[in-house]
């Protein structure tokens, strides 16, 4: 899994007039990390683990970045021509990633009223637009605005790419939290399914980093993919992750089945409770 930093900004307009303020959230490695507090006009960490990432440093840089990005997005919304009466939103999602081989990716995506209409691979400068005519119109509108001052735009997006990666590297380098290894807690449960069958579920929780192998084995051999159900690996709100895998087995054969877990080079097997 690559390390990633994801910015999600939203600005609003009412009856064609762009509203002051903006909404902003930042995710680090898929975990809620920062949000913009509109009352205090400050970037605020989301939970204790986010505070731990930067230790005792202030969030001034993050506040400045989010404020600047919010201002840019409001200007972009002001140039969208098709704003009818009522409430409209412009959302920008920006993601940068550092992969295991040290390669980087950076992209940004624009949504109008929740509908994707423009994406850019920032490294290559390739823009992509969905097929719908509304998306095409909106994309042309926004791209024309961005092109009005091509040099500023070029500098802005390359700086944005560099800043995102710089921030991500800064968090990764400064933070013991992001280099830690937290082994999962594994819990196996059973429930009656249909006559003669039971469903066994293996849950792994509170682990970090995100990469994990969780699978059911019968007589020591992994079951095929299509006989198991997997849950997504999801953040649990504490800077760690959780997931699950389930399968259906014949009652009385419980002792033949084990849940196999592998995480950060460690592995363990867990029997079905009788």
């Amino acid at each position: 899994e690559p390390h990633s930093l994801r910015y999600n900004l939203t600005v609003l307009s009412w009856d064609g007039s762009v509203q002051s303020g903006f909404l902003a959230e930042v995710h680090l490695d898929g975990q809620p990390f920062l949000r913009y507090d509109r009352q205090k006009c400050r970037a605020k960490p989301q939970g204790q683990w986010a505070e731990d990432v930067l230790g005792n440093k202030t969030w001034d840089r993050e506040t400045r970045d989010l404020t600047g990005n919010g201002k840019d997005l409001r200007m972009t919304l002001a140039h969208i021509k098709d704003q009818k009466e009522g409430l409209h939103s412009l959302q920008e999602i920006r993601v940068c990633e550092i992969h295991e081989d040290n390669s980087t990716r950076s992209s940004q995506h624009f949504y109008y009223d929740g509908e994707l209409f423009l994406s850019q691979n920032v490294e290559t400068e390739e823009w992509t637009v969905p097929q719908s005519s509304r998306a095409q119109t909106l994309a042309m509108n926004v791209r024309n605005f961005l092109k009005e001052d091509a040099m500023k735009t070029k500098t802005h997006y390359h700086a944005m790419h560099a800043d995102c990666l710089q921030e991500l590297r800064r968090y990764l380098e400064s933070s013991v939290v992001l280099r830690r290894r937290v082994p999962p807690m594994v819990n196996v449960t059973r429930s009656e399914a249909s006559e003669g069958n039971i469903t066994v579920t293996c849950r792994a929780s509170s682990f970090y980093p995100r990469n994990i192998t969780l699978t059911w084995r019968q007589d020591g051999v992994s079951l095929s993919h299509d006989t198991q159900q997997w849950g997504d690996v999801l953040p649990d709100g504490n800077g760690t992750y959780q997931t699950w895998v389930a399968t259906r087995i014949c009652q009385g054969e419980e002792q033949r089945f084990t849940c196999y877990m592998e995480h950060s080079g460690n592995h363990s097997t867990h029997p079905v409770p009788s």
């Epitope: 992969h99 081989d101 390669s103 980087t104 990716r105 992209s107 994406s119 691979n121 490294e123 290559t124 400068e125 390739e126 823009w127 992509t128 091509a150 735009t153 070029k154 390359h158």
Partner: antibody, heavy 115, light 108 residues
Framework: QVQLQESGPGLVKPSETLSLTCTVS?????????WNWIRQPPGKGLEWIGF???????KYNPSLKSRVTISRDTSKNQFSLKLSSVTAADTAVYYC????????WGQGTTVTVSS | EIVLTQSPATLSLSPGERATLSCSAT???????FHWYQQKPGQAPRLLIY???NLASGIPARFSGSGSGTDYTLTISSLEPEDFAVYYC?????????FGQGTKLEIK
């Protein structure tokens, strides 16, 4: 109809600089897209050399970066490739192409590096 | 850089048969930045399929593409004589853009 046409010398001496130009008709190189150079040595596969984008940004293949310069002349709607210190390994068909999924190509020009 | 490996290197089939060509990447690629090309001797390559599954202009419907992440496939449902050529995959997710080494589709 978008068309790309490569031009330049077919024979270059070792250690000299290879220079090629791609003339684009039917589309402005400042409107959109990346404008690429790609080469193919005899009997081998395709190798991306680099591009100049619609905004003027250049990107190069790291394996050639120290020897490559891609530039553009917007008044003539052309972009150019310069590859310095050439050797026999640079003998190839050189193509110019538009885009990121390369949707339009020139017909290619063969460059031989030989004394 | 992302290395693309195509398999098989050569595929020998007869007209009317189904062809399946594979392309595997060393790192995950966004499907919107993955493309296939066809090249015939003495000609420039031509775009066949863009963004994993979209037919380029003028390409017949017997060609199709699929895949995500690191594994992509080009399928020709029923081979026509003019389909025998070399096929290349290409990624545009990261710099440098890279091509697979090619699969030669030849008449059996």
């Amino acid at each position: 109809q978008v068309q790309l046409q490569e031009s330049g010398p077919g024979l270059v001496k070792p250690s000299e600089t290879l220079s090629l130009t791609c003339t684009v008709s039917g589309y402005s190189i400042t409107s959109d897209y990346a404008w690429n150079w790609i080469r193919q040595p005899p009997g081998k596969g395709l190798e991306w050399i680099g591009f100049v984008s619609y905004s003027g940004t250049t990107k190069y293949n790291p394996s050639l970066k120290s020897r490559v310069t891609i530039s553009r002349d917007t008044s003539k709607n052309q972009f150019s490739l310069k590859l310095s210190s050439v050797t026999a390994a640079d003998t190839a068909v050189y193509y110019c192409a538009r885009g990121y999924g390369f949707d339009y190509w020139g017909q290619g020009t063969t460059v031989t590096v030989s004394s | 850089e992302i290395v693309l490996t195509q398999s098989p290197a050569t595929l020998s089939l007869s007209p009317g048969e189904r062809a399946t060509l594979s392309c595997s990447a060393t790192s995950s690629i966004s499907s919107i930045y993955f493309h296939w090309y066809q090249q015939k001797p003495g000609q420039a390559p031509r775009l066949l399929i863009y963004r994993t599954s979209n037919l380029a202009s003028g390409i017949p419907a017997r060609f199709s593409g699929s895949g995500s992440g690191t594994d992509y496939t080009l399928t020709i449902s029923s081979l026509e004589p003019e389909d025998f050529a070399v096929y290349y995959c290409q990624q545009g997710t990261t710099i440098p853009f890279t091509f697979g080494q090619g699969t030669k589709l030849e008449i059996k």
